[in-house]
């Protein structure tokens, strides 16, 4: 999948590790797609290094990336989304390393948003809802979501729930009474498209009611 140019001029350059990783985001800005790449070694001297993608493009042979600090990116409508593209790291006119990648297999969804938790007193449960921009998209519509929650004092004790809808019910009896909880959600492609987890949504914080001593039930907030 990846190859190094054999050229004496590049001897010094080839001592470096030019491994890189990329992710795509489809219809991230209207009908525009984006592709973001970065070197895996943060110490690579990127001064004269550029990225280029060729193949599986509409109307054009190749596209150049723009550089923003250590990140290289393209925003375009010209991804064919069928077959593999060749992504190369270049210095001058020489390719240092290339990878053949199908952009539909490196999709990173946009982070969910509008996460909220509503307590239902009568049902003794919490209804968790959130939104995703992918409901409106033509391509990456089907996602798996990972809802993670923890008691605020338990730094690393996250409970995870996977679901395909944007609504989840948490039973009150499964949570500690009179406790502050943090909850967040992320998404990953789940049908045809493959790739990576999105960034986490902003966290939402909620408090569970106290237990009502006479009935053994929690008091509403």
């Amino acid at each position: 999948e990846s190859g190094y140019a054999q050229n004496g001029d590049l001897e010094d350059a080839e001592l470096d590790d030019y491994s890189f990783s990329c992710y795509s985001q489809l219809e991230v800005n209207g009908s525009q797609h984006s592709l973001t790449c970065a070197f895996e070694d943060p110490d690579v001297n990127i001064t004269n290094l550029e990225f280029e993608i060729c193949g599986a493009l509409v109307e054009v042979k190749c596209l150049n990336f723009r550089k923003l600090q250590e990140i290289y990116f393209i925003e375009t409508k010209k991804f064919l989304l069928i077959g593999k593209s060749n992504i190369c790291v270049k210095v001058g006119e020489k390719s240092l390393t290339c990878k053949k990648i199908d952009l539909t297999t490196i999709v990173k969804p946009e982070a969910p948003f509008d996460l909220s938790v509503v307590y239902r007193e009568g049902a003794n449960d919490f209804v968790v809802t959130f939104n995703t921009s992918h409901l409106q998209k033509k391509y990456v519509k089907v996602l798996m979501h990972d809802v993670a929650y923890r008691q605020e004092k338990d730094e690393n004790k996250w409970t995870h729930v996977n679901l395909s809808s944007t609504k989840l019910t948490l039973l009150q009896r499964k949570l500690q009474p009179a406790a502050m909880y943090e909850i967040k959600v992320r998404s990953i492609p789940d049908h045809y498209f493959k790739g990576f987890w999105s960034e986490w949504s902003p966290s939402y914080y909620f408090r569970t009611p106290e237990i009502n001593n006479s009935s053994g039930e929690m008091d509403p907030i």
Partner: antibody
Framework: QVQLQESGPGLVKPSETLSLTCTVS?????????WNWIRQPPGKGLEWMGY???????TYTPSLKSRITISRDTSKNQFSLKLSSVTAADTAVYYC????????????WGQGTTVTVSS | DIQMLQSPSSLSASVGDRVTITCLAS??????LAWYQQKPGKAPKLLIY???RLADGVPSRFSGSGSGTMFTLTISSLQPEDFATYYC?????????FGGGTKVEIK
């Protein structure tokens, strides 16, 4: 085959508004690309003025930002340039062209139309 | 704004000569550079894009090289139809800017 054709008055009075239209054939201005205006004063070099993107958003060169408007009529597959408060310095050949943004070129150009600013 | 300094501003050459025009960007622009040819009374014509790639239908005697800040357009063997003005242009950042042009005249 993509073709672009500029049209509009060849003479504009100082302080008035210059209006030009670019008619595109062989490609829809709503499909992709940026649709640009470039001008060239007599005997001088080229100056990029701005574009309207296929999505309808616009970007202008800062030196003209207060005077320039680029719009489009999708039903006629046209995009237009308006330049207000013109002076003799705006006398130039005006070109429309396709490209830029995610590609590093203007691949199709109109033949150009000469606009003279004079009373 | 990124300044594009083109040199020379004019040159005289004969048919068959090798001609080199340079374009120096005031800051690094990667491969975001194009070269155009313009003949009197005509619109510019794309020759080279992405600094080194030959546009469709352009003769192979034209070539582009460079990346970053220093770019070169070379005509390996000048033909009678190549006498024209040549411009470089950067697409790296707004406003997109052109070089001042190089007029190639018959010696």
């Amino acid at each position: 085959q993509v073709q672009l054709q500029e049209s509009g008055p060849g003479l504009v009075k100082p302080s008035e508004t210059l209006s030009l239209t670019c008619t595109v054939s062989g490609y829809s201005v709503t499909t992709d690309y940026a649709w640009n205006w470039i001008r060239q004063p007599p005997g001088k070099g080229l100056e990029w003025m701005g574009y309207i993107f296929y999505s309808g958003s616009t970007t202008y060169t800062p030196s003209l930002k207060s005077r320039i408007t680029i719009s489009r009529d999708t039903s006629k597959n046209q995009f237009s340039l308006k330049l207000s408060s013109v002076t003799a310095a705006d006398t130039a050949v005006y070109y429309c062209a396709r490209g830029g943004y995610d590609v590093n070129y203007f691949d199709y150009w109109g033949q150009g139309t000469t606009v003279t600013v004079s009373s | 704004d990124i300044q594009m300094l083109q040199s020379p501003s004019s040159l005289s050459a004969s048919v068959g000569d090798r001609v080199t025009i340079t374009c120096l960007a005031s800051q690094t622009i990667g491969y975001w550079l194009a070269w155009y040819q313009q003949k009197p009374g005509k619109a510019p014509k794309l020759l080279i894009y992405a600094a080194t790639r030959l546009a469709d239908g352009v003769p192979s005697r034209f070539s582009g090289s460079g990346s970053g800040t220093m770019f070169t357009l070379t005509i390996s063997s000048l033909q009678p139809e190549d006498f024209a003005t040549y411009y470089c242009q950067q697409f790296f950042s707004y406003p997109w800017t052109f070089g001042g042009g190089t007029k190639v005249e018959i010696k």
